[in-house]
Amino acid sequence: YDFTNCDFQKIEADYLRTISKDLITYMSGTKSTDFNNTVSCSNRPHCLTEIQSLTFNPTPRCASLAKEMFARKTKATLALWCPGYSETQINATQAMKKRRKRKVTTNKCLEQVSQLLGLWRRFIRTLLKKQ
């Protein structure tokens, strides 16, 4: 999906109002400095691409974050403010439901959510303060 035509201001507002709090709750008891940055993004569409990938694509070390509250809210926000996003996700969601196992919060999932926080922080800063 191409995130270029999303309403970035509305997504930013949703993130600050709810998603950020859910991410921080998930990370409770863990400092963000416990993990090095291992993923970055270079503009708002790119940030949303990487956020979608980390949130919804299962990885071998962290099977699925998709049922977490922050993930549900992320999905709802993208569906609301990115034209045509929900249509592109129907098939992917159905495939994921079939293979989902019971979630256990592992250190690798904490690391992945720490990276998500970093991506969201980059997304909400409109400009670097300087060149």
Epitope: N36, N37, T38, V39, S40, C41, S42, N43, H46, E50, R122, R125, L127, L128, K129, K130, Q131
Partner: antibody, heavy 122, light 108 residues
Framework: QMQLVESGGGVVQPGRSLRLSCAAS????????MHWVRQAPGKGLEWVAV????????HYADSVKGRFTITRDNSKNTLNLQMNSLRAEDTAVYYC???????????????WGQGTMVTVSS | SYVLTQPPSVSVAPGQTARITCGGN??????VHWYQQKPGQAPVLVVY???DRPSWIPERFSGSNSGNTATLTISRGEAGDEADYYC???????????FGGGTKLTVL
């Protein structure tokens, strides 16, 4: 663990070519800008070239423009530096380094390789 | 081309504060990054975006930047701080990375 490992250095005659590589691991390579920086023996750091996270754009120091080419393969997590028409003044340790970027601005180089030595001598 | 000027050497007594400067025209309008390099090793980022510090760098390292001078401050100097220090900026207008000439810090 995040790691950058350079290879391909060696001794080469003036006017000849050499290709350096940098293997990245422990981070999502395709999301970072990547630099080559060199250091002549006993001298300071000199920036050589940078390539965008996507590989879509490149920039070079005037001292290497037209002779060096920076490329990347995001599917293999590798960065390359093709060095042609080498001169004695290109003798240096060559480091690769990663850099987050925002729009067209490159940020600090937060992970560095250990370097590979290139000696240009007849 | 843009030039960053650093003093070739700075000395500090153990436990005292060292200040390493990086001069450039209107450098305060750029984000300045600082690197530490010990003999035979690769550079290590110690301060970025003027005054931010990577999580693995001690609080003794700090930075500031305004006008024509950026400064790296190392408080309570230790023998392990002996190294070369380089400032760096990215000049987006010319698409160039610029390093200062480096400063050798000696802890007496």
């Amino acid at each position: 663990q995040m790691q950058l490992v350079e290879s391909g250095g060696g001794v080469v005659q003036p006017g000849r070519s050499l290709r350096l590589s940098c293997a990245a691991s422990g981070f999502t390579f395709r999301t970072y800008g990547m630099h080559w920086v060199r250091q002549a023996p006993g001298k300071g750091l000199e920036w050589v070239a940078v390539i965008w996270y996507s590989g879509s754009d490149t920039h070079y120091a005037d001292s290497v423009k037209g002779r060096f080419t920076i490329t990347r393969d995001n599917s293999k997590n590798t960065l390359n530096l093709q060095m042609n028409s080498l001169r004695a003044e290109d003798t240096a340790v060559y480091y690769c380094a990663r850099s987050p970027q925002w729009e067209d601005i490159f940020e600090s180089m937060d992970v560095w390789g250990q370097g590979t030595m290139v000696t240009v001598s007849s | 081309s843009y030039v960053l000027t650093q003093p070739p050497s700075v000395s500090v007594a153990p436990g005292q504060t060292a200040r390493i400067t990086c001069g450039g025209n209107y450098i305060g309008s750029f984000s300045v990054h600082w690197y530490q390099q010990k003999p035979g090793q690769a550079p290590v980022l110690v301060v970025y975006d003027d005054s931010d510090r990577p999580s693995w760098i001690p609080e003794r390292f700090s930075g500031s930047n305004s006008g024509n001078t950026a400064t790296l401050t190392i408080s309570r100097g230790e023998a392990g701080d002996e190294a070369d220090y380089y400032c760096q900026i990215y000049v987006s207008a010319s698409r160039l990375v610029v390093f200062g000439g480096g400063t050798k810090l000696t802890v007496l």
